[in-house]
């Protein structure tokens, strides 16, 4: 499986909200020996690999943002902790998965990373990602709301596997 | 905050089994891997192999098939180590060490030391 | 497997001084490497983390570099507490394996 991320640079005002996306490609076992382990952090564009570094999201670690469940199922994170700081986590039966940011400030401006395992019986874990850059804006060059710009075809597919 | 605790010192005869205990707290216990880790005395760290709780998945090193059982209750946060037929190259310090997928052991036990001897 | 090679079994400095420790996978490995420290009567401690980044809390003195096949551990300034035997591990596929581990002494 890839994981996509169709948008690639989202730009957004100070105080507004937005979600950021990726998608789970390609074939995806629904066995009952699959376990999908999806998370979020903060990274940066490493010489050699983007998202090897992981940093929290507003000091909540990937392991405090992960969601774990089977196939295509759909899940949310542990609503207190991560609604506390403005964040939330979440998967349908898609293979879409997301994290909402709340409020957004300067601060928040960065690469963040998703990461999908999959987790099998007897076999090596299975590991990718996707990155995208968060500019939060202020002031009068500010956009009124969210302006997302598409990931290119090669980007978007941008697959890291162990 | 993230913690390890795992039961205390083993002696044991040749031919016995024992059965060592790693539990886990301040974390979703579930969600990440449990890897056990033998040190002989004097010697480096060898993987004896991983336990994922929330499914029961586990991958073990070929070193230590047969000798290793690994099994995890998620009703107490624990997982268990049981080595089988113990010879005296079992003797070692075992360890527990939480794994997150796809990334490292960030979180290690204390050490059980075993014992085996005559 | 992947064998993880430590070519020193000993490092001996004093206090103060840069040391490094290098480490060199039989494959390539990519980033996925981390190094550990094992101080005496003590659990190991991960401190570096695909191959470079520093784990929470671990002083800015310790550094790692490399990729691919060959990786390297610093100590920019050695300090008495930092006696220790420190141990790579990669963690590109399993079996996870470690090196013998390079047990650093200081004069």
């Known amino acids: 499986f890839k994981v996509a991320t169709p948008y690639s640079l989202y730009v957004c005002p100070e105080g507004q909200n937005v979600t950021l996306t990726c998608r789970l490609l390609g074939p995806v076992d629904k066995g009952h020996d699959v376990t999908f382990y999806k998370t979020w952090y903060r990274s940066s564009r490493g010489e050699v690999q983007t998202c090897s570094e992981r940093r929290p999201i507003r000091n909540l670690t990937f392991q405090d943002l992960h969601l774990h469940h089977g196939g295509h199922q759909a899940a949310n994170t542990s609503h207190d902790l991560a609604q506390r700081h403005g964040l939330e986590s979440a998967s349908d039966h898609h293979g879409n998965f997301s994290i909402t940011m709340r409020n957004l400030t300067l601060l928040d401006s960065g690469l963040y990373c998703c990461l999908v395992v999959e987790i099998r019986h007897h076999h090596s874990e299975h590991r990718v990602h996707g990155a995208m850059e968060l500019q939060v804006q202020t002031g009068k060059d500010a956009p009124s709301n969210c302006v997302v710009y598409p990931s290119s075809s090669q980007d978007s597919e941008n697959i890291t596997a162990a | 905050q993230v913690q390890l605790q795992q039961s205390g010192a083993e002696l044991m005869k040749p031919g016995a089994s024992v059965k060592i205990s790693c539990k886990a707290t301040g974390y979703t216990f579930s969600s990440s891997w449990v890897e056990w880790v033998r040190q002989r005395p004097g010697h480096g760290l060898e993987w004896i192999g991983e336990?994922?709780?929330?499914?029961?998945?586990?991958h073990y090193n070929e070193k230590f098939k047969g000798k290793a059982t690994f099994t995890a209750d998620t009703s107490s946060n624990t997982a268990y180590l049981q080595l089988s037929s113990l010879t005296s190259d079992d003797s070692a310090v075992y360890y527990c060490?939480?794994?997150?997928?796809?990334?490292?052991?960030?979180?290690w036990g204390a050490g059980t030391t075993v014992t085996v001897s005559s | 497997d992947i064998v993880m090679t430590q070519s020193h079994k000993f490092m001996s400095t004093s206090v103060g001084d840069r040391v490094s420790i290098t480490c060199k996978a039989s494959q390539d490995v990519s980033t996925d490497v981390a190094w550990y420290q094992q101080k005496p009567g003590q659990s190991p401690k991960l401190l570096i983390y695909?191959?470079?980044y520093r784990y929470t809390g671990v002083p800015d003195r310790f550094t790692g570099s490399g990729s691919g096949t060959d990786f390297t551990f610093t100590i920019s300034s050695v300090q008495a507490e930092d006696l220790a035997v420190y141990y790579c591990q990669q963690h590109y596929s399993t079996p996870w394996t470690f090196g013998g581990g390079t047990k650093l002494e200081i004069k």
């Open positions: 336990i994922f709780p929330g499914s029961g998945s586990t």
């Open positions: 060490a939480r794994r997150p997928p796809g990334w490292f052991f960030d979180v």
């Open positions: 695909s191959a470079s």
